[in-house]
């Protein structure tokens, strides 16, 4: 018969013959023959392999490294990698997460869009007319302005994206 | 910095228990397996088994399985070891370990004495 | 379980001189560790994943092997050099230890 020019899924082309790949968890040893099946061999402690694969070494888990503010958010398994985040009020400084970064605070005349997570910043967004804030904040939104007609009062000094309006009394009207 | 610190030396008569504890710093106890290890005077390093502290899920070598018990506290970050009816072969340095990747020191405790004499 | 062997168990080296320590397992193992050990200290981690050098670890220290065959090698022998080294499996229960090379300086 032809030798083999694909082979199914789960399995690999090698001196012209189909071997299995090794299941996720494991390393290939060696490759299969006319007579033998592949040798696969469990990754040991600490490493993994996540797919089905013909690798002849497992990969390390990775390491949370506490000293970039890293910590773990799910440990590795033999087919799976460690999962990091970062400690409260910090966040991942890449897709990969290998080190963390202060979130970032939103200045006066800006609101907290979105809070940060452990794996995005915080998103800041100016605040609107009839909005303020005067604080830099990682939490904090922009307020709405007073309404000083609802408390019977008059705006003696109009808000700006930074401040709140001052309400003071009505003139009395003279006799 | 990460640390494994663990309990003073203990001296024991035979037939009685001990309880050795392993309190880590600069990581939490829950994300890595603890080993415990034991070396007897003058002899190598033998492993004796290891603990997942996160769900207590353990592995013991069948030689001290009956004989060592582990388990840890979260809340404290410790790891303990007891070790049961006690004889004068019970008698070593028992340390506790990390994975070996933690920070790729691979972490060890000082080392406690287990003296069982009559 | 896996049993491993070193070989050495006691050797002794002159300064310079290149140094090889064997550890071999009764099957395939995924990786080797190695520790060094001094007397009235806790091991150190030497040499993980087979061939990777722990912190700290001098760069004349070496290590190798694949499936049931291991080896550290120590390019050119110092003084502080002169330990216990032993191998370790991680990858079958019960995880187990070679029985120490014991290597003196002449």
């Known amino acids: 018969p032809e030798p083999p020019t694909a082979c199914r899924e789960k399995q690999y082309l090698i001196n012209s013959q189909c071997c299995s790949l090794c299941q996720p968890g494991q390393k290939l040893v060696s490759d299969c023959t006319e007579f033998t099946e592949t040798e696969c061999l469990p990754c040991g402690e600490s490493e993994f392999l996540d797919t089905w694969n013909r690798e002849t070494h497992c990969h390390q888990h990775k390491y949370c490294d506490p000293n970039l503010g890293l910590r773990v958010q799910q440990k590795g398994t033999s087919e799976t990698d460690t999962i990091c985040t970062c400690e409260e009020g910090w966040h991942c400084t890449s897709e990969a997460c290998e080190s963390c970064v202060l979130h970032r605070s939103c200045s006066p005349g800006f609101g907290v869009k979105q809070i940060a997570t452990g794996v995005s910043d915080t998103i800041c967004e100016p605040c609107p007319v009839g909005f303020f804030s005067n604080v830099s904040s990682a939490f904090e939104k922009c307020h709405p302005w007073t309404s000083c007609e609802t408390k019977d009062l008059v705006v003696q000094q109009a808000g700006t994206n930074k401040t709140d309006v001052v309400c003071g009394p009505q003139d009395r009207l003279r006799a | 910095e990460v640390q494994l610190v663990q309990s003073g030396a203990e001296v024991k008569k035979p037939g009685a228990t001990v309880k050795i504890s392993c309190t880590v710093s600069g990581f939490n106890i829950k994300d890595y397996y603890i080993h415990w290890v034991k070396q007897a005077p003058g002899k190598g390093l033998e492993w004796m088994g290891r603990?997942?502290?996160?769900?207590?899920?353990?592995k013991y070598d069948p030689k001290f399985q009956g004989k060592a018990t582990m388990t840890a506290d979260t809340s404290t970050d410790t790891a303990y070891m007891e070790l049961s009816s006690l004889r004068s072969e019970d008698t070593a340095v028992y340390y506790c370990?990390?994975?070996?990747?933690?920070?790729?020191?691979?972490?060890w405790g000082q080392g406690t004495t287990v003296t069982v004499s009559s | 379980q896996i049993v491993l062997t070193q070989s050495p168990t006691i050797m002794s080296a002159s300064p310079g001189e290149k140094v090889i320590i064997t550890c071999s397992a009764t099957s395939s193992v995924s990786y080797i560790l190695w520790f060094q050990q001094k007397p009235g200290t806790s091991p150190k981690l030497w040499i993980y994943?087979?061939?990777n050098l722990a912190s700290g670890v001098p760069a004349r220290f070496s290590g190798s092997g694949s499936g049931a065959s291991y080896s550290l090698t120590i390019s050119r022998m110092e003084a502080e050099d002169a330990a216990t080294y032993y191998c370790?499996?991680?990858?079958?229960?019960?995880?187990?230890f070679g029985g120490g090379t014991k290597l003196e300086i002449k």
């Open positions: 994943s087979t061939s």
């Open positions: 370790q499996q991680r990858t079958f229960y019960p995880y187990t």
């Open positions: 603990i997942d502290p996160e769900d207590g899920d353990t």
């Open positions: 370990t990390t994975s070996y990747y933690v920070g790729t020191y691979g972490y």
